[in-house]
């Protein structure tokens, strides 16, 4: 009689996680009598996947009715495949006995599971940086299989080239993770900018996954200061204005100093937003020119986003005409007491 053969025609089968897999197995003879069992793996640690005689295998069904007379097809159907199901499956013929005796194994079918990558998560730097500095963004995605994957970085739609990508583990595995770090040079116009990490994988059918991060979380645009004075209608008053321009984020503390001594402090409130996302703000003082002493210096000092203060000074200019308007007895503070101390606009 011809020796029984166990035939597993497919060397490998690949399915997407969540789908079903069919593992084919036929035998060439009905003799000797005995059951077929399916195992994942070989050796002493192999797992019983299906045994017709006994056991509960809720995810496994036979393709044909194995109890039918003369049945030689012992293919199985495994539902709801997960990455943990990956491995080599063996169809094994046993000879009936007490206990049953293993007789012959098929060559094995390797089941590989295609699994979608998780949505990419992009994280930026923990501290803000100023324009012209380089910041790093990291993109991570997990749980995909097979290992082949493509990751691209974009800034405002333009592809970036300065990045480094790792896929782990290096060898074969049930599933893989990708981690990529991109380096981005900041510019003053980046408050509205966005970086995008795009992941393409065979399971995504040409529709890549994207993760984004806003550069507004990573950038600090320091302000430029300008201090100037303008005459007011009242001949003995001038308006000294501190113009704070092009800063981001909004957090700003402004202090006026008169000859180095603090005269008032205010927090930026009503800001003007520029098209590029930065902000402008102005603060002013009404100064009584009659109360001046020679060489009064007014300093506008700005502390932006917790950074060391920057300042701009202005020497008060009083014209001869203004001096003439003052009576000899006039005295008091330089800052007009009845005028509002500051303002914004």
């Amino acid at each position: 009689e011809e020796e029984l053969q166990v035939i597993q025609p497919e060397k490998s089968v690949s399915v997407t996680a969540g789908e079903s897999a069919t593992l084919n197995c036929t035998v060439t003879s009905l003799i000797p009598v005995g059951p077929i069992q399916w195992f994942r793996g070989a050796g002493p640690g192999r797992e019983l996947i299906y045994n017709l005689k006994e056991g509960h295998f809720p995810r496994v069904t036979t393709v044909l009715d194995p109890t039918k007379r003369n049945n030689m097809d012992f293919s199985i159907h495994i539902s709801n495949i997960t990455p943990a199901d990956a491995g080599t499956y063996y169809c094994v013929k046993f000879r009936k006995g007490s206990p049953d005796v293993e007789l012959k194994s098929g060559a094995g079918t390797e089941l590989s599971v295609r699994a979608k990558p998780s949505a990419p998560v992009v994280s930026g730097p923990t501290a803000r940086a100023t324009p012209e500095h380089t910041v790093s963004f990291t993109c991570e995605s997990h749980g995909f299989s097979p290992r082949d994957i493509t990751l691209k970085w974009f800034k405002n739609g333009n592809e970036l080239s300065d990045f480094q990508t790792n896929v782990d583990p290096a060898g074969k595995s049930v599933s893989y993770s990708i981690r990529s770090t991109a380096r981005v040079v900041l510019t003053r116009r980046d408050v509205h900018s966005q970086v995008i990490c795009e992941v393409a994988h065979v399971t995504l059918q040409g529709d890549p996954l994207r993760g984004t991060a806003n550069l507004s979380e990573a950038i600090r645009v320091p302000p430029t200061l300008e201090v100037f004075q303008r005459p007011m209608r009242a001949e003995n008053q001038v308006n000294v204005t501190c113009q704070v321009r092009k800063f981001y984020p909004q957090r700003l503390l402004l202090t006026w100093l008169e000859n180095g001594n603090v005269s008032q402090t205010e927090t930026a409130s009503t800001l003007t937003e520029n098209k590029d996302g930065t902000y402008n703000w102005r603060s002013w003082l009404l100064v009584n020119t009659c109360a001046h002493r020679d060489g009064v210096v007014l300093t506008c000092q700005v502390e932006h986003d917790g950074q060391p203060a920057v300042s701009k000074s202005h020497a008060l200019e009083v014209s001869a005409h203004q001096k003439e308007q003052c009576s000899d007895t006039t005295s008091g503070p330089v800052l007009a007491p009845t005028a509002p101390l500051g303002g914004s606009g």
Epitope: G41, A42, G43, P44, G45, T88, R95, G171, K172, V174
Partner: antibody
């Protein structure tokens, strides 16, 4: 090309726990058994135990109460822990990959680490 | 446990000449599927062991064909058709049928 690299302390005090890690590079943990084998100075080889890719462990009964083998598939590593060591545990410790193609038997320990010498001494 | 016994303990050889090592197991290593789960390893001086033969007679990848394994049940033999200088070291048999896996005591092959 699959490579195995053992790592861990070269000196362990008596009664303490010996901990070794084997890093698998260039290949998969899947479908293989991952073994620890030791060789005392000037002596033969002793199988300590192995772990399959599904986490099932098998130990040498002569060591079973003291040995634990674990697997970290995400790191492509497997580890050996042996408690209450004595001078008799001084040996070269090898990690190795064991193949299984058919039946309940095994089909050769085909990849070995270079071995790490562990001395048990106070 | 299955006990593995190797002979001889030491084997002086002449390069170019054949050599033979015997390994006996305390119980049959022939499984019901027809495979005999016995391996042969060579450990060269200062190196890790290297797989030569598995399932009694199958040569491992990259192993020269001067090495051959035979036997069934409890009696196994490793033959080297023409010994080369690089074959010096300790040869071990190992049963791989059941745990605990067990090794023979080793046969030291050295050049005469």
């Amino acid at each position: 090309q699959v490579q195995l690299q053992e790592s861990g302390p070269g000196l362990v005090r008596p009664s303490e726990t010996l901990s070794l890690t084997c890093t698998v590079s260039g290949g998969s943990i899947r479908n293989y058994y991952w073994s620890w084998i030791r060789q005392p100075p000037g002596k033969g080889l002793e199988w300590m135990g192995f772990i399959y890719d599904n986490g099932r462990t098998f130990y040498n009964p002569s060591l079973k109460s003291r040995v634990t083998i674990s697997l970290d598939m995400s790191m492509n590593q497997f580890s050996l822990k042996m408690t209450s060591v004595t001078a008799a545990d001084t040996a070269v410790y090898y990690c190795a990959r064991v193949r299984a193609y058919s039946g309940i038997g095994l089909d050769g320990t085909d990849v070995w680490g270079q071995g790490t010498t562990v001395t048990v001494s106070s | 446990d299955i006990v593995m016994t190797q002979s001889p303990l030491s084997l002086p050889v002449t390069p170019g000449e054949p050599a033979s090592i015997s390994c006996k197991s305390s119980q049959s290593l022939l499984y019901s599927n027809g495979y005999a789960y016995l391996d042969w390893y060579l450990q060269r001086p200062g190196q890790s062991p290297q797989l030569l033969i598995y399932q009694g007679s199958n040569r491992a990848s990259g192993v020269p064909d001067r090495f051959s394994g035979s036997g069934s049940g409890t009696d196994f033999t490793l033959k080297i058709s023409r010994v080369e200088a690089e074959d010096v070291g300790v040869f071990y048999c190992m049963q791989a049928l059941q745990t605990p896996l067990t090794f023979g005591g080793g046969t030291k092959v050295e050049i005469k």
